[in-house]
């Protein structure tokens, strides 16, 4: 019996087609992805093959103005239109709190939404009961397939799930659910979830009875043969893991942002054992037509976005200096504003010992592309912020050793004075440079804000200590020459859309007046 699994993950609000790098589509003839194009390909495959499941491994939420405006309603609407069969909850599905998941998505989705390792407690337990499930048995042709969901247990540090959801260890939570499916005579089981490729592989290895793992969170690109675009494969598609009980378990993921549609064909024997598996992600490039009816619907929903872009988010009573003459040479108040917003967006008081789990922010000055003049009645709009942060990036959470941070700050000024983008703006950090010293030895003081303290204060950076830092995904990926971050990071979790972080902060503060306050000094 053959099953075709079509899968997406980490779509992050890319409802419209995007450029090859998943930013805003500029030249339509070279654009990719989007739900209208995805629908075309899904429909083609459904037409051609008998047993097809369309699955999403989480993180539909967060990433473009679509999510900012529609807050998840767009996800439910278009996933319903594409007739998804199941979705796993990702960490970003909790970005607007549990209510922001329940109302727009859980109550509106016409497909099951899954996670076996999230347990509700207190008053939430009855409110959310039945709205998401640990597993679902789906009829496919003449057979049944069990789908069991899982979500990163780091979600409380990455999003806003509140205090009434407990995120258990994935493997511990999955095993009894899979066992339950086996007792129900379901012998074909897919683990669908959002914990990253390493955990996907562990699930394939450790959870008895799981036949296939469809994952997300780590934006992993797997491919067999010559890859069709810029993404470099982390391994073959599917990635085969030998389970502890000796089975070959295919593990798949389909990069991110709706750029690819994962396509996996599995052949099962009559006892539900995987005989063979093959496939590849399908690049959704512009040669695949956008479905006209879905496209028309997208255009209808778009109207509200255009209106939103020009509405006031808040006010500034000071000039927001985002000029390259400032931000690439010294502390600039636009850099301070953005870093403060980044930290504010990551306030998660999850432990009595810590006032917060993260206190530090770094931001490449070259990523700040425009100032905002306060003389326009102080008004700040989304459109203004899009000029400051035009690249459609995310502000991510990483874990780095102090020694890596020191290298990053040396890199920040290694060729100071040439208006290059690597000069770092900061938050929760006090740095002093001596430019008279040779490159690589210019950081004379580097103090960081404590987290394990009731009264935050600045202490010298410790080389062997592991620190959490919020930074642009561009830096996490080694951009602007920050190879040491990419090479030495110990953990990387993708965060919220950059503009969304700053806009939320401005809306929350209502009136802002960031200052230049001595975060960066020269001796």
């Amino acid at each position: 019996w053959e099953l075709t699994i079509l899968h997406t993950n980490d779509v992050h609000s890319r409802l419209e087609q995007t450029s090859e790098d998943s930013s805003k589509c500029v030249n339509a003839s070279r654009c990719m992805g989007g739900v209208a194009r995805l629908f075309t390909k899904v429909q083609q495959i459904r037409r051609a093959e008998p047993n097809v499941l369309l699955l999403d491994a989480g993180d539909q939420y967060q990433g473009t103005i679509w999510f900012t405006v529609y807050k998840g309603a767009e996800v439910a609407h278009f996933m319903n239109a594409l007739r998804y069969d199941a979705m796993a909850l990702g960490n970003h599905e909790f970005d607007n709190g549990v209510e922001g998941l329940i109302e727009p998505l859980l109550k509106e989705a016409k497909f099951p939404i899954l996670s076996a390792n999230i347990k509700a407690k207190g008053p939430l337990a009855s409110q959310i009961s039945g709205l998401y499930l640990p597993y679902k048995v789906l009829p496919v042709g003449d057979e049944v397939v069990g789908i069991v969901g899982y979500t990163s247990k780091e979600t409380p540090f990455l999003s806003n799930p509140g205090t009434n959801l407990v995120f258990e260890d994935e493997i511990t939570a999955l095993q009894p659910e899979v066992d339950k499916l086996k007792t129900l005579n379901v012998n074909k089981i897919i683990a669908l979830g959002h914990s990253g490729f390493e955990m996907d592989k562990l699930i394939a290895q450790k959870v008895r009875g799981v036949d296939v793992v469809v994952g997300g969170h780590s934006n992993t690109f797997l491919y067999t043969g010559n890859p069709p675009s810029k993404e470099v494969p982390a391994g073959k598609y599917p990635f085969i893991v030998t389970s502890d009980d000796g089975r070959k378990v295919p593990v798949v993921q389909a990069y991110a942002f709706g750029k690819y549609l994962g396509y996996l064909k599995i052949e099962f024997d009559e006892r539900g054992n995987v005989i063979s598996s093959h496939g590849n992600p399908i690049l959704l490039n512009s040669s695949i037509p956008e479905d006209p009816s879905i496209k028309a619907d997208i255009n209808k929903w778009r109207i509200k976005l255009d209106n939103y872009s020009t509405q006031e988010l808040g006010k500034t009573i000071v000039y927001l200096d985002g000029s390259s003459q400032s931000c690439r040479f010294r502390e600039c108040n636009m850099g301070n504003l953005i870093c403060d917003a980044m930290i504010n967006n990551n306030l998660r008081h999850t432990d009595e010992m810590f006032w917060n789990h993260v206190s530090m922010c770094i931001l490449n000055g070259g990523g700040i592309r425009s100032p905002i003049d306060e003389r326009n009645n102080g008004t700040i709009t989304w459109e203004n912020l899009a000029a400051v942060l035009p690249f459609g990036g995310t502000f991510d959470l990483v874990q780095l050793k102090g020694s890596t941070l020191k290298k990053a700050f040396e890199h920040s000024v290694h060729r100071y004075g040439q208006s290059t983008g690597e000069f770092l703006q900061v938050g929760g950090i006090h740095v002093v440079y001596d430019l008279s010293r040779k490159p690589g030895d210019r950081v004379v003081k580097l103090d960081v804000l404590c987290t394990k303290c009731r009264v935050p204060s600045y202490d010298p950076l410790k080389m062997d200590e592991v620190y959490k830092v919020i930074l642009p995904n561009f830096l996490a990926n080694g951009g602007d020459g920050f190879q040491m971050i990419k090479d030495e990071l110990l953990r990387h979790d993708s965060g919220d859309q950059d503009i969304n972080v700053v806009s939320t902060y401005i809306s929350k503060m209502k009136v802002i007046y960031p200052a230049v306050e001595g975060r960066i000094k020269f001796s």
Epitope: E2, S29, T40, Q44, I45, R47, A48, E49, P50, Y263, I282, L283, N285, S286, S287, I288, P289, E290, D291, P292, K295
Partner: antibody
Framework: EVQLVQSGAEVKKPGESLKISCKGS????????LSWVRQMPGKGLEWMGE????????YYNEKFKGQVTISADKSISTAYLQWSSLKASDTAMYYC??????????????WGAGTTVTVSS | AIRMTQSPSSFSASTGDRVTITCKAS??????VAWYQQKPGKAPKLLIY???YRYSGVPSRFSGSGSGTDFTLTISCLQSEDFATYYC?????????FGGGTKLEIK
């Protein structure tokens, strides 16, 4: 090398049955769709229907539904077009054409050389 | 069924000429349009797929454009081997329909 090899020309009488074939080689037969296209003498192209040999799913142009049957034998990588009762108006050239539904070339990328069917009393 | 109206039905041109053939769909077909070349006694050959993508091995003088309902095939510098009949086809919805064809003849 991808090839679609069609069976030879046929001359038939009205009311007779006929089954013409199209054998695919040089590619995975079950991973592509196969269509049949009719071209009457001096006329244009008409899509008759298609089969996906991997699943056996068939789709017909309403105009030809009930008039012809499309089938495939994946064990020998061959698709068929058959008539149970031919009419003089079935006289035409019949082409099979391949369709890559997993790829992005929206069109028929390979065609057979065609099978001439002549129906005459 | 979606109708594909092709024009002109025939056209006389000389080698070196620039020739444009148009095709109009009766409803929005996005970019799901292909163009074929057929010579007498031969099977059609795919030239352009998805409205504007040149199929492998097709000379660069052939180009396609359009989306929605209006499509064009352009031959920038006509060669002697280009005299043939050209068909557009929509691949958006079944029944997949072809235009009536444009016969390109030597002037």
């Amino acid at each position: 090398e991808v090839q679609l090899v069609q069976s030879g020309a046929e001359v038939k009488k009205p009311g007779e049955s006929l089954k013409i074939s199209c054998k695919g080689s040089g590619y995975t037969f079950t991973s592509y769709g196969l269509s049949w296209v009719r071209q009457m003498p001096g006329k244009g192209l008409e899509w008759m229907g298609e089969i996906y040999p991997g699943s056996g799913n068939t789709y017909y142009n309403e105009k030809f539904k009930g008039q012809v049957t499309i089938s495939a034998d994946k064990s020998i990588s061959t698709a068929y077009l058959q008539w149970s009762s031919l009419k003089a108006s079935d006289t035409a050239m019949y082409y099979c054409a391949r369709y890559d539904y997993l790829g992005s070339s929206y069109g028929f990328d390979y065609w057979g050389a065609g099978t001439t069917v002549t129906v005459s009393s | 069924a979606i109708r594909m109206t092709q024009s002109p039905s025939s056209f006389s041109a000389s080698t070196g000429d620039r020739v444009t053939i148009t095709c109009k769909a009766s409803q929005d077909v996005s970019t799901a349009v292909a163009w074929y070349q057929q010579k007498p006694g031969k099977a059609p050959k795919l030239l352009i797929y998805s409205a504007s993508y040149r199929y492998s091995g097709v000379p660069s003088r052939f180009s396609g454009s359009g989306s929605g309902t209006d499509f064009t095939l352009t031959i920038s510098c006509l060669q002697s081997e280009d005299f043939a009949t050209y068909y557009c086809q929509q691949h958006y919805n079944t029944p997949y329909t072809f235009g009536g064809g444009t016969k390109l003849e030597i002037k």
